[in-house]
Amino acid sequence: FERTRSLQDPCSNCPAGTFCDNNRNQICSPCPPNSFSSAGGQRTCDICRQCKGVFRTRKECSSTSNAECDCTPGFHCLGAGCSMCEQDCKQGQELTKKGCKDCCFGTFNDQKRGICRPWTNCSLDGKSVLVNGTKERDVVCGPSPADLSPGASSVTPPAPAREPGHSPQ
């Protein structure tokens, strides 16, 4: 089948890094600068991605593979293949449409991206609080109160408001 196909379509012989040039009797021509073909048999080469502005080059474009971008310091990748760069916030903050905002009381964010999340309510999982939560850290749950030996104590956290009142995100 492959042999038959190549007789019918000379373009199928063109390897990655080349394209089948209709203007030159379907000869396999190398991809021009700043373009690539990652598979054989292509009739055109694709334009290389350019990592500009907040994007920086993680891998240079070659004749057979596209460039890969990541983000400059202070930003992180979002989307497939780092299609966007989003501003970092500090731990204990979340990125809203108005910029980085501190987590409200009763919520935390232990990363430079994402939202502020409510502290875990240990009692709902039948456990007690071992370590209080902060803006940067969730509470740490321990054994259930019944598992604690007499005289042992667990930290009682301040009760977070049911509606912590996130800044809009």
């Epitope: 979002l78 991206r113 999982d125 509470v139 049911r162 509606e163 912590p164 996130h166 809009p168 995100q169």
Partner: antibody
Framework: QMQLVQSGAEVKKPGASVKVSCKAS????????MHWVRQAPGQGLEWMGW????????NYAQKFQGRVTITRDTSASTAYMELSSLRSEDTAVYYC?????????????WGQGTLVTVSS | SYELTQPPSVSVAPGKTARITCGGN??????VHWYQQKPGQAPVLVIY???DRPSGIPERFSGSNSGNTATLTISRVEAGDEADYYC?????????FGGGTQLTVL
């Protein structure tokens, strides 16, 4: 390619409990939150809660607090959702779903769903 | 608690543009995600952070969000787009879904 594979259909009596599992096969980076969402027959999607597989931290929808428990077994790359005191209104397809890398509640991968039927 | 309102159904002819709305108080200040669900299947994320598309989702799908309304727009509608569509936001410790919109391709 990461896939979420859930346990099979269950039939339960009112008042009983059900525990549904969700195994991540393929590459699943650490720290991706796992959510549980249910859908009653002919109805919309209803969020139940999440677990942070890295820490075990949870958050539950107010409606289910006291009846739902979400746990995980990191060594088996599996999350579990247990719902107790079942009633007929809990008949639904239960989905696990992975939150995406931006950690902004976008659910970018879903299990195939587990039908739980509650009937006397 | 926060509520999201979607029209129960939207009908559109093939090749035309479908617009599905999701209403909520000051929803423009929130990040909205959209899911497509075909009968008997799990939902699929089609738009996230208001207007971004996951890989594999056609460019025909786009989103916008301002004021009290977020909108999912599907241009050049195809028969295969017939499905239920749900919007979703995060509000004060809870994930909230809209009631869903059934898109019918005439």
């Amino acid at each position: 390619q990461m896939q979420l594979v859930q346990s099979g259909a269950e039939v339960k009596k009112p008042g009983a409990s059900v525990k549904v599992s969700c195994k991540a096969s393929g590459y699943m980076p650490d720290g991706y939150y796992m959510h549980w969402v249910r859908q009653a027959p002919g109805q919309g999607l209803e969020w139940m809660g999440w677990i942070n597989p890295r820490t075990g931290g949870t958050n539950y929808a107010q409606k289910f607090q006291g009846r739902v428990t979400i746990t995980r077994d990191t060594s088996a790359s599996t999350a579990y959702m247990e719902l107790s005191s079942l009633r007929s209104e809990d008949t639904a397809v239960y989905y696990c779903a992975r939150e995406g890398a931006a950690f902004r509640l976008e659910l970018d991968a879903w299990g195939q769903g587990t039908l739980v039927t509650v009937s006397s | 608690s926060y509520e999201l309102t979607q029209p129960p159904s939207v009908s559109v002819a093939p090749g035309k543009t479908a617009r599905i709305t999701c209403g909520g108080n000051n929803i423009g200040s929130k990040s909205v995600h959209w899911y497509q669900q075909k009968p008997g299947q799990a939902p699929v994320l089609v738009i996230y952070y208001d207007s971004d598309r996951p890989s594999g989702i056609p460019e025909r799908f786009s989103g916008s969000n301002s004021g009290n309304t977020a909108t999912l727009t599907i241009s050049r509608v195809e028969a295969g787009d017939e499905a239920d569509y749900y919007c979703q936001v995060w509000d004060s410790s809870s994930v909230v879904f809209g009631g869903g919109t059934q898109l019918t391709v005439l």
